[in-house]
């Protein structure tokens, strides 16, 4: 049960009391008002939202609620001057060329300022050459395709579907190969559920739609201008061929009907096999270059896109805490969409909106938290999660001394089917405590408990009667606390079966479509799942900053870290020769895990026993459970990825989106069997598991008696 | 160094099953597709499938009407070839071979004979 | 199904001499064919791809050309461990196939 005795006024006035307060009526009200007119970052439109917002929560009744902007690199289409790819022929005619917009919803057709399909940060240029299907062109598509079917995309333009990894990692992967261009398409075969109708009729990807979408490879920084530290008014600028993570060549989104017309023509090799083939009617011919008839003809990119440094604004409320207010809940997701953002951010957005309310509500009645809550608006995570990173840069030293835990809330929803969670090891009992007490909205699950529901759809694969929770990757706004800073950090929303929808994300992403109609008829008509979000979020908001002992359990980390051991163990097992040749031990790493182990156990013994009526002991205890998570930070961070400093878990290299757990050992194993130097190779592994050692040793001391 | 590595020859009675084994060794066998190839005696090679070890998804020749069936064992980096309803044309050795169209690396071929 | 035809079905040739086989494409495959040799007893070996890029450890004397359906494989100075059955593959179109072999005798 939840222990909220730290502050009320009233007894009534405690976690029940929060989430009763929550109404999805309000979240469907909040959707309504902020999906009516795009609020693309660095746009007027975007400020009024702002200020907007900033005057709501204060008349929810937070104690402060103040902008912060800073001027970043930003990147929009040239209005005139408009991008789109072409196939030529022989004479340099344009025979063919792609949709300059997507066709409007209906209801929508005279609302102005809706950006056409781009990929952000896109150098300009007008490339031309043979075309290459590189499949997903993740990094084992490229593999295939140089090692195995010897296709050199040195000089050639090369189209890859969206989905399976984040398409700023395509974009990388491309550059890599030699391409001089990528064309980013949405196959069906990913965006398009059978037995669904295309909108508006229905869920599904039209031919004509478009995901739009940074392709920046940052990882981590920030402005691409000012990694490390803030965009604020006397920041140093790096110069544009200094600026972090741009890529060096054009990139262009398509839907499939244009896709169609240019993977129709392809020549050269067949797919390698039916993993490479979407379900578009064209052989999915790998290239390079048109065939036969069509061998004359090639693709020409017309990219006249610009970098432009821009204002944006983060909303940041302050619910002052009553007993610690230098200890800091964060509640965040941003505000800033590509079009109308009916799903992304929006629906996150609501959610925040009415948790903020209900908060607001209970402090007009005299109640105040344990703990200060920050809640915030963060602009222009769409362009590489700019918002949040700014003000975690301009704001760190505080944070790293004072932030107990980040809970992100952008999407509500990717899905009706079942919850899903990403967090830390700490928030495993959280969730679970927290999902026990709510009711499921599932049909069929009618009196039973979101834990319950949540189990049965998504099982644990490790632990039979639990549900499954992710690990944390990144491509949104908790990275900076979670992979920088070390700070606790969890997220949840309501997703697809992923194992009856195996397209990728859900069809409409960043498409014009994603309007306020998608989820109110085909998604959430009632906005029970919204509802089930917004309590599943301000839930652990509400525990996080009132539970007198911090809602954290080491133990559970003791787990997973052991669990980790023996994956990346498993790993380099399969290179048993070499291991031995390069006397590769992990002893100290096992060692390390079961020291923290015991230390843990030990800890988690003290934890109940511990006099709590004492604050000083009581301060004591939550610092070393607030300062865990930071201890697994390592200062000097990940090899060429000094913003990513988490020793057990990173984004993985070779996809944004996903976490790795230790990551500094993951990628010094990877691919080794190619370097060409075996003996640094392996010595690289000898020294990365060394830093894991050491570090999870240092954590474990951390939860040791202080003296 | 790269191998692959096929079971031993086999005498099979028409109407029979033969199911053949290629193990991987050297390289990550999920990297890479694995693909059969089989010679009858003093023909042309002929590709029956293959098989992305990764994801255990086969594309088949059509030729062989869903008499093929090829699996693998990424546990045990080793993929299998299983041909059914046999007949006597269908003596010949039975190559699994790396890559994905093109074939740089083969295993030593196993001798399927079919008679009754 | 694309059919690969090779001619001439066997050949023989003296040491030193240019040899040329050919292999025709029922349908246009653009450039991709490739080329194996197969010695007595022994598995095929990978010699060029893309019609005409040699593979790793493969003597320049061997060389390919074509696209569309005609495709040349040349020795340009034959030697006696050349001699081997020679196939072409497709690799545009599933099914994969490979041409009836060119069987290469020395005189």
């Known amino acids: 049960k939840s222990s909220n005795e730290a502050t009320n006024i009233t007894p009534k006035h405690n976690m029940k009391a929060f989430l009763d307060e929550l109404k999805a009526e309000n979240i469907k009200k909040f959707l309504y008002n902020f999906t009516q007119i795009p609020h693309l970052a660095g746009t007027e439109q975007n400020f009024q939202l702002a200020k907007q917002i900033q005057s709501q929560w204060k008349e929810f009744g937070l104690d402060s609620v103040e902008l912060a902007h800073y001027d970043v690199l930003l990147s929009y289409p040239n209005k005139t001057h408009p991008n789109y790819i072409s196939i030529i022929n022989e004479d340099g005619n344009e025979i063919f060329n792609t949709s300059l917009f997507e066709p409007p919803p209906p209801g929508y057709e005279n609302v102005s300022d809706i950006v056409p399909p781009f990929s952000a940060f896109s150098p300009q240029g007008m490339p031309e050459g043979d075309l290459v299907y590189v499949n997903y062109a993740r990094t084992e598509d490229f593999f295939k395709l140089e090692r195995d079917m010897k296709i050199n995309c040195s000089g050639k333009i090369v189209i890859a579907r969206y989905g399976k990894v984040f398409r700023g990692n395509k974009v990388k992967n491309a550059q890599l190969a030699g391409a001089k261009g990528v064309i980013l398409y949405s196959d069906p075969a990913d965006y398009f559920a059978p037995g669904v109708k295309s909108y508006p009729d229905g869920w599904n990807l039209p031919g004509g739609g478009v995901q739009r979408g940074n392709i920046l490879n940052l990882n981590g920084a920030g402005d691409p201008l000012t990694p490390g530290y803030p965009a604020n008014e006397y920041a140093y600028r790096r110069g544009i061929a200094e600026a972090v993570g741009l890529p060096s060549i054009p990139v262009h989104p398509i839907g499939y009907y244009d896709a169609q017309k240019l993977l129709e023509k392809m020549g050269g090799s067949a797919p390698p096999d039916s993993s490479w083939r979407g379900s578009l009617k064209v052989p999915y011919n790998v290239g390079p270059g048109f065939t036969g008839n069509f061998s004359t003809q090639k693709v020409k990119m017309h990219i006249h896109s610009t970098n432009e440094v821009t204002r944006i604004y983060n909303v940041i409320g302050t619910l002052r805490g009553a007993v610690e207010p230098d200890r800091y809940v964060i509640l965040g997701g941003h505000r800033d969409s590509w079009v109308f953002g009916g799903i992304d951010p929006q629906s996150g957005a609501a959610v925040v909106h009415e948790i903020v309310r209900s908060f607001g509500t209970l402090k007009k009645e005299g109640w105040r938290p344990r703990r200060t809550i920050l809640f915030a608006s963060w602009d222009a995570e769409e362009f590489g999660l700019l918002g949040s990173t700014e003000w975690a840069e301009e704001n760190s030293r505080l944070l790293q001394e004072r932030g107990v835990a980040y809970i992100n809330a952008d999407s509500s929803i990717e899905g009706n089917y079942t919850l899903r969670v990403d967090c830390t090891p700490l928030m495993y009992s959280l969730v679970h405590n927290l999902t026990k007490e709510l009711k499921s909205p599932d049909e069929g699950f009618e009196g039973k408990s979101l834990y319950e529901s949540w189990t049965k759809k998504s099982p644990s694969p490790e632990f039979s009667g639990m549900p499954r929770i992710s690990k944390l990757g990144s491509g949104n706004d908790f990275e900076v606390f979670f992979q920088r800073l070390g700070i606790a950090s969890g997220r949840a929303r309501y997703t697809k079966n992923w194992e009856t929808n195996k397209f990728s994300g859900y069809p409409l992403y960043h498409s014009v479509y994603e309007t306020y109609e998608l989820v109110e008829k085909f998604y959430d008509p009632m906005f029970k799942y919204h509802l089930t979000v917004a309590q599943v979020r301000g839930g652990m908001v509400f525990e996080l900053a009132n539970s007198i002992v911090l809602p954290f359990d080491c133990r559970d980390y003791a787990v997973v870290l052991r669990k980790y051991a023996d994956k990346i163990y498993s790993i380099s097992m399969k290179h048993p020769q070499e291991m031995k040749t390069y006397s590769v031990s992990f002893d100290s790493l096992f060692s390390a895990v079961k020291n923290f182990t015991e230390i843990a156990s030990k800890f988690s013994e003290r934890l109940q026993d511990f006099d709590k009526s004492n604050p000083i002991v009581l301060r004591m205890m939550n610092d070393q459970l607030m300062f865990l998570e930071r201890a697994f930070i390592d200062p000097l961070g990940l090899p060429d990825r000094p913003f990513y400093r988490h020793v057990i878990y990173a984004p993985s290299s070779h996809n944004k989106y996903a976490g790795e757990s230790f990551p500094g050992i993951y990628d010094a194993l990877f691919d080794i069997e190619s370097k060409v130097d075996p003996s640094k190779a392996w010595g690289e592994v000898k020294r990365q598991i060394y830093v894991a050692a050491f570090t999870v040793q240092a954590a474990a001391e951390t939860l040791s008696e202080v003296a | 160094e790269f191998q692959l590595v096929q079971s031993g020859a086999e005498v099979k009675k028409p109407g029979a099953s033969v199911k053949v084994s290629c193990k991987a060794s050297g390289y990550s066998f999920t990297d890479h597709n694995m693909n059969w190839v089989r010679q009858a005696p003093g023909q042309r090679l002929e590709w029956m499938g293959l098989i992305n070890p990764n994801y255990g998804t086969a594309d088949y020749n059509q030729k062989f009407k869903g008499r093929v069936t090829i699996t693998r064992d990424t546990s045990a980096s080793t993929a299998y070839m299983e041909l059914s309803s046999l007949r006597s044309e269908d003596t010949a050795v039975y190559y699994c071979a790396r890559g994905s169209s093109l074939f740089a690396y083969w295993g030593q071929g196993t001798l399927v004979t079919v008679s009754s | 199904d694309i059919q690969m035809t090779q001619s001439p079905s066997s050949l023989s040739a003296s040491v030193g001499d240019r040899v040329t086989i050919t292999c025709k494409a029922s349908?246009?495959?653009?450039?991709?064919v490739a080329w194996y040799q197969q010695k007595p007893g022994k598995v095929p070996k990978l010699l060029i791809y893309?019609?005409?890029t040699r593979h790793t450890g493969v003597p320049s004397r061997f060389s390919g050309s074509g696209s569309g359906t005609d495709f040349t494989l040349t020795i340009s100075s034959l030697q006696p461990e050349d001699v081997a059955t020679y196939y072409c593959q497709q690799y545009s179109r599933y099914p994969l196939t490979f041409g009836q072999g060119t069987k290469l005798e020395i005189k």
């Open positions: 349908q246009g495959v653009d450039t991709a």
């Open positions: 893309w019609a005409s």
